[in-house]
C-alpha cells in the first residue's frame, strides 16, 4: 500500500545506508569566521549513506520514487539521504553594537530519511 | 552569511540542475493495481537533476553541506534534489465495503530544492 512501513535494516551492510554522521568543521571551513565568533569549531551532524529500496522512506513519494527507479533507473533517480529534522544551535556573532546570540534551527541535522 | 540567497541559474546548462519533471506511471508500475481503481495512469512530478554549489539550497544546512562537500568530497556528499512541497492527489480505491476516495498529501512533488 501507499503507507507501507519504511524498512530500517540496511541490506548493504553496517554503516552503508542513510544515517547521521558527525563532521567537524571550523568557522574557516564554513567561511563564517568574519561574522561568527563562537564556537570556533562546530560538530555538524549530516546525513550520509545510500538509500536502497524502501530503506527509511520519508513518505509515499519516496516509496514511489524507489519503485520507479527500479523500473526506469535512467529517468528516475534513487531516493537520497537528507535530514528529517534539525537540532537548533546557538551561535555568538558580531553585530554593529558588539556581540549577540542567535539561534539557527536548520543548521545541524538531528535525524535522516530517504526522500 | 548563513542566509545567503540560494542560486537559481544552473551553471551546468539547461535541464541539468535540480528541477521538477513529469513521469508517467501506471498502477501496475507502482504495484497498486490490486487496491487503487482510479486513475489508471498517474502523472507523477518528481525532482531530478544535480545540485551544484549553492543551487536552490533548501536551508543553512544545505549551504554548509555544499561548502563541506567542496572541501571533503569523500566524507560529505553533495546536496541532492528532493521535493520542497507536494500537490495533493485524490485516488479512488477499494475498501471492504466498496469504494472510497482518499487524498494523498505526499505523493506528487510540487517544487524541488537541494537538501
Amino acid at each position: 500500500s501507499a503507507h507501507a512501513h519504511p524498512r530500517d535494516s540496511c541490506p548493504l551492510g553496517p554503516g552503508r545506508c542513510c544515517h547521521l554522521e558527525t563532521v567537524q568543521a571550523t568557522l574557516e571551513d564554513l567561511g563564517w569566521s568574519d561574522w561568527v565568533l563562537s564556537p570556533r569549531q562546530l560538530q555538524l551532524s549530516m546525513c550520509v549513506g545510500e538509500c536502497p529500496h524502501l530503506y527509511r522512506s520519508a513518505n509515499t513519494h519516496a516509496q514511489i520514487k524507489a519503485r520507479l527507479h527500479g523500473l526506469q533507473p535512467d529517468k528516475v533517480p534513487a531516493p537520497c539521504c537528507v535530514p528529517s529534522s534539525y537540532t537548533p544551535v546557538v551561535l555568538m556573532h558580531r553585530t554593529d553594537s558588539g556581540v549577540s546570540l542567535q539561534t539557527y534551527d536548520d543548521l545541524v541535522a538531528r535525524g535522516c530519511h530517504c526522500a | 552569511s548563513a542566509h545567503a540567497h540560494p542560486r537559481d541559474s544552473c551553471p551546468l546548462g539547461p535541464g541539468r540542475c535540480c528541477h521538477l519533471e513529469t513521469v508517467q506511471a501506471t498502477l501496475e508500475d507502482l504495484g497498486w493495481s490490486d487496491w487503487v481503481l482510479s486513475p489508471r495512469q498517474l502523472q507523477l512530478s518528481m525532482c531530478v537533476g544535480e545540485c551544484p554549489h549553492l543551487y536552490r539550497s533548501a536551508n543553512t544546512h544545505a549551504q554548509i553541506k555544499a561548502r563541506l562537500h567542496g572541501l571533503q568530497p569523500d566524507k560529505v556528499p553533495a546536496p541532492c534534489c528532493v521535493p520542497s512541497s507536494y500537490t495533493p492527489v485524490v485516488l479512488m480505491h477499494r475498501t471492504d465495503s466498496g469504494v472510497s476516495l482518499q487524498t494523498y498529501d505526499d505523493l506528487v512533488a510540487r517544487g524541488c530544492h537541494c537538501a
Epitope: 563562537s38 564556537p39 537540532t87 537548533p88 544551535v89 546557538v90 555568538m92 556581540v99 534551527d105 | -
Partner: antibody, heavy 119, light 110 residues
Framework: EVQLVQSGAEVKKPGESLKISCKGS????????IGWVRQMPGKGLEWMGV????????IYSPSFQGQVTISADKSISTAYLQWSSLKASDTAMYYC????????????WGQGTLVTVSS | QSVLTQPPSVSGAPGQRVTISCSGS????????VNWYQQLPGTAPKLLIY???NRPSGVPDRFSGSKSGTSASLAITGLQAEDEADYYC??????????FGGGTKLTVLG
C-alpha cells in the same frame, strides 16, 4: 568526570566589590561556554550571561547588563562573576553552568556560591 | 513575571503519574527546544530533559518530556519520595535569550 567547583560563600557590605569563581575540570574548558544563573532567596532561576572562555566573548541578559562583569582565565580553567559595588538586592545564590554542545541548555552545574549583602 | 509559565505547585501520591506544564509563546517554546531541570532541596539544579524529550544518561525513564506548539510538559510516572523537588523549564527567547519558567514545587504525598 566533568566538574564545576565554585568558590565559597561570601558576606559583604553594600558598596563593596566582589569576584566569585567557577573552576572547570574533566573536560576541555575552552570548548564549552559557561553561563551564570542567579537564584534569589525562595525564588526561581534567572540567566545572567554567558562567556566563551576561548575568546572571552561575553553576552549579558538585558536585566544584568552593566550590573556585573563576567570574565575567564583559560590558563587555569576558571570563569568569574564580579560586582564593583554590591547592593542588598544582590543577595542570592549564584550558579555557574556549562552549556551543552549546541548552546541551548546547561548540562553541568556548579554547587553554587551564596552571596549575602548586608549592612 | 517569568517569560515561561509553570504552575507553582503540583502533588501526587507515590506510584502515581504527575505532569508539569510550561507555557510559552511563538518567540520561545514555539521556535526552540525546551529543557527541564530538577532542583532537590538545598542543591544545585540538574539537567533532567534536554531538547524536548531527551534524557541525559543516569536520568530514570520515569521522567519524560514533550512539546506541542508553544507549550511543553514534563511527566513523571511511578512517583517516588525522592522526586520531591522544584522543577524548572527553560528555553530560548528572541528578546532575552535564555529564559526559565518560574518553577514548580512537586510534593509527594503520604
Amino acid at each position: 568526570e566533568v566538574q564545576l567547583v565554585q568558590s565559597g560563600a561570601e558576606v559583604k557590605k553594600p558598596g563593596e566589590s566582589l569576584k566569585i569563581s567557577c573552576k572547570g575540570s574533566g573536560y576541555s574548558f575552552t570548548s564549552y561556554w559557561i553561563g551564570w544563573v542567579r537564584q534569589m532567596p525562595g525564588k526561581g532561576l534567572e540567566w545572567m550571561g554567558v562567556i566563551d572562555p576561548s575568546g572571552s566573548y561575553t553576552i549579558y541578559s538585558p536585566s544584568f547588563q552593566g550590573q556585573v562583569t563576567i570574565s575567564a582565565d583559560k590558563s587555569i580553567s576558571t570563569a568569574y562573576l564580579q560586582w564593583s559595588s554590591l547592593k542588598a538586592s544582590d543577595t542570592a545564590m549564584y550558579y555557574c553552568a556549562r552549556y551543552g554542545r549546541y548552546g541551548t541548555y546547561f548540562d553541568y552545574w556548579g554547587q553554587g556560591t551564596l552571596v549575602t549583602v548586608s549592612s | 513575571q517569568s517569560v515561561l509559565t509553570q504552575p507553582p505547585s503540583v502533588s501526587g501520591a507515590p506510584g502515581q503519574r504527575v505532569t508539569i506544564s510550561c507555557s510559552g509563546s511563538s518567540s520561545n517554546i514555539g521556535v526552540l527546544y525546551v529543557n527541564w531541570y530538577q532542583q532537590l532541596p538545598g542543591t544545585a539544579p540538574k539537567l533532567l530533559i534536554y531538547s524536548n524529550d531527551n534524557r541525559p544518561s543516569g536520568v530514570p525513564d520515569r521522567f519524560s518530556g514533550s512539546k506541542s506548539g508553544t507549550s511543553a510538559s514534563l511527566a513523571i510516572t511511578g512517583l517516588q519520595a525522592e522526586d520531591e523537588a522544584d522543577y524548572y523549564c527553560q528555553s530560548w527567547d528572541s528578546s532575552s535569550n535564555y529564559v526559565f519558567g518560574g518553577g514548580t514545587k512537586l510534593t509527594v504525598l503520604g
